[in-house]
Interface confidence: medium
């Protein structure tokens, strides 16, 4: 969570001198309560905007919006607090909207915005504002919050902003797996632009079970530039497991601009189609367990074996 | 009520420059996206490209070595530019807003929408390609 | 790209029917999906958005619902401003593509 650093967010408006400054999220008057407090903010929206920075990178930004209610506790108003929440990791942010005139009437409805909070692919978020001063030990609150869902980076518009471009959003692999037998898989692919090496990870399951019967990783080498944007086949050796018939294809890349991070994208082979009495599965045990430290998946020849090439 | 106009020449010679201009008028163009789509005599809708307030613009690969969409924030204008044009380009031209996204609220607990998709177009120009 | 397919092309129908219109996706789209109606000369108009909310000033008679890659919009009581031609749009995934229409026409 940061806040965009340009341009200079404003918050005064006609009829409102106003400024905008950083706050620790623990307003004055939490320690020092006042009798006479504003009512809640009304009708609060978070929008998904884009913002560009100087650099010209393009960031997700949360647009937070909201009015007042048309009483007379603005006599009362000295600004409010905006604080936004990571839900997953219980990071906050917060700035102040300072009030450096009184709000005397309503003739027209107050409305504020605030599109300077930066926010990350698929995180969720808890948006609330304040009204200052925060009320008294008691009383009637005076905030009002949303939670707010950014999008992944699949989604059309995410696709493009920095964060997600910077973990490989714009390769598209195209991935298809073929049964080759029941031995075999071909796995052709689209590399990306970049001389950065690939790993295949194969899990493989029995029909309707989750419980992996067989699990491969194969590590396909860098390509050369000629190669850029060609595809790529590997042919994948399966353990002959009867029943082991569902497979997951897994291409991570490690692209230089998120290493060991960047999006992973999948395809799934299912089973044939069951006869109407299938003869039972056996309950399979992963083949080994995942060293402490290492990968969740390791290469192993004894396990499967694979061969690649590249197509021009 | 936000509305959009387009404007341009109604009839281009085939290997010129087919330019077309969106007028967007009752709102501002900021923190919108702005697309062009086009629909050929008694054919579908094809979507030919979008741009962003700040520039930032995505094009239908179909039609990408062709094309240029640009903004005019002063303006409240973005325009089109399609290069080297031939018979197969006449069609009706529509400007079209992608909405905003927001998030809706159910009973008693919430719901995300990313909603882009045209929600407010123009009435569209139909551009002929002849000598 | 994303190929939208619709079902049926086009159909006949009297005042009152119930009307259903089908739009698959090639790959998934989660409910990144609008309906749009299209009357001869006019530009197309927004009917749903995010697959199944109706758009605001859209007569309650019109609806949607799917997810992933197979959707449907309903007419429930065809009435005579519904007969025009109805398409679907994803905008899941860049290039945004369309439906090839359903043209709804008096039986």
């Known amino acids: 969570l940061r806040l965009l650093d340009f341009p200079a967010p404003v918050c005064a408006q006609e009829g409102l001198s106003c400024r905008v400054k950083n706050s620790t999220c623990l307003d004055d008057s939490w320690i020092h309560p006042r009798n006479l407090t504003p009512s809640s903010p009304k009708d609060l929206q978070i929008q998904l905007h884009f913002a560009h920075t100087q650099q010209g990178d393009l960031f997700p930004v949360a647009h937070i919006e909201w009015t007042l209610q048309t009483d007379a506790s603005i006599l009362y108003l000295e600004g409010a607090e905006l604080s936004v929440l990571q839900l997953n990791t219980n990071e906050r942010l917060c700035v102040r909207f300072e009030f450096l005139s009184k709000l005397r009437h309503h003739h027209r409805r107050w409305r504020f915005t605030f599109s300077h909070f930066v926010v990350d692919p698929d995180q969720e978020y808890e948006v609330t504002v304040h009204h200052l001063p925060k009320p008294i030990p008691d009383g009637d609150p005076n905030h009002q919050s949303k939670n707010f869902l950014v999008p992944d980076c699949e989604h059309a518009r995410m696709k493009v902003t920095t964060p997600c471009m910077s973990s490989g959003s714009l390769w598209d692999p195209n991935i298809t797996v073929e049964t080759l037998d029941t031995q075999h898989l071909r796995v052709d692919f689209t590399l990306w632009n970049e001389s950065t090496h690939y790993q295949i990870l194969l899990t493989s399951f029995p029909h309707m079970e989750n419980h992996s019967c067989f699990e491969h990783m194969h590590h396909i080498p860098a390509p050369r530039p000629e190669e850029f944007h060609q595809r790529s086949n590997v042919t994948l050796t399966l353990r002959n497991l009867k029943g082991c018939c569902r497979h997951q294809v897994q291409i991570q890349p490690f692209f230089s601009s998120c290493l060991n991070d960047c999006l992973r994208h999948s395809a799934t082979v299912s089973c044939p189609e069951m006869p109407d009495t299938p003869e039972p599965i056996p309950d399979y045990m992963p083949l080994w367990e995942p060293r402490s430290g290492s990968s969740d998946y390791k290469d192993d020849d004894d396990k499967g074996s694979s061969h690649h090439h590249h197509h021009h | 009520q936000v509305q959009l106009q387009e404007s341009g020449p109604g009839l281009v010679k085939p290997s010129e420059t087919l330019s077309l201009t969106c007028t967007v008028s009752?709102?501002?163009?900021?923190?919108?996206?702005w697309n062009w789509i086009r629909q050929s005599p008694g054919k579908g809708l094809e979507w030919i490209g979008d741009?962003?307030?700040?520039?930032?613009?995505n094009y239908n690969p179909s039609l990408k070595s062709r094309v240029t969409i640009s903004v005019d924030t002063s303006k409240n204008q973005f325009s089109l530019k399609l290069s080297s044009v031939t018979t197969a380009d006449t069609a009706v031209y529509y400007c079209?807003?992608?909405?905003?996204?927001?998030?809706?609220?159910?009973?008693?607990?919430?719901?995300?929408?990313?909603?882009?998709?045209?929600?407010?177009w123009g009435q569209g120009t139909t551009v002929t390609v002849s000598s | 790209d994303i190929l939208m397919t619709q079902s049926p092309s086009s159909l006949s129908a009297s005042v009152g029917d119930r009307v259903t219109i089908t739009c698959r996706a090639s790959q998934g789209i989660r409910n990144d999906l609008g309906w749009y109606q299209q009357k001869p000369g006019k530009a197309p108009k927004r009917l749903i958005y995010a697959a199944s909310s109706l758009q605001s000033g859209v007569p309650s008679r019109f609806s949607g619902s799917g997810s992933g890659t197979e959707f449907t919009l309903t007419i429930s009581s065809l009435q005579p401003e519904d007969f025009a031609t109805y398409y679907c749009?994803?905008?899941?995934?860049?290039?945004?593509?369309f439906g090839p229409g359903t043209k709804v026409d008096i039986k």
């Open positions: 079209a807003r992608d909405g905003e996204l927001a998030n809706y609220y159910g009973s008693g607990s919430y719901q995300f929408y990313y909603y882009y998709g045209m929600d407010v």
């Open positions: 749009l994803q905008h899941n995934s860049n290039p945004f593509t």
């Open positions: 009752g709102g501002s163009i900021s923190n919108y996206y």
């Open positions: 741009i962003y307030y700040s520039g930032s613009t």
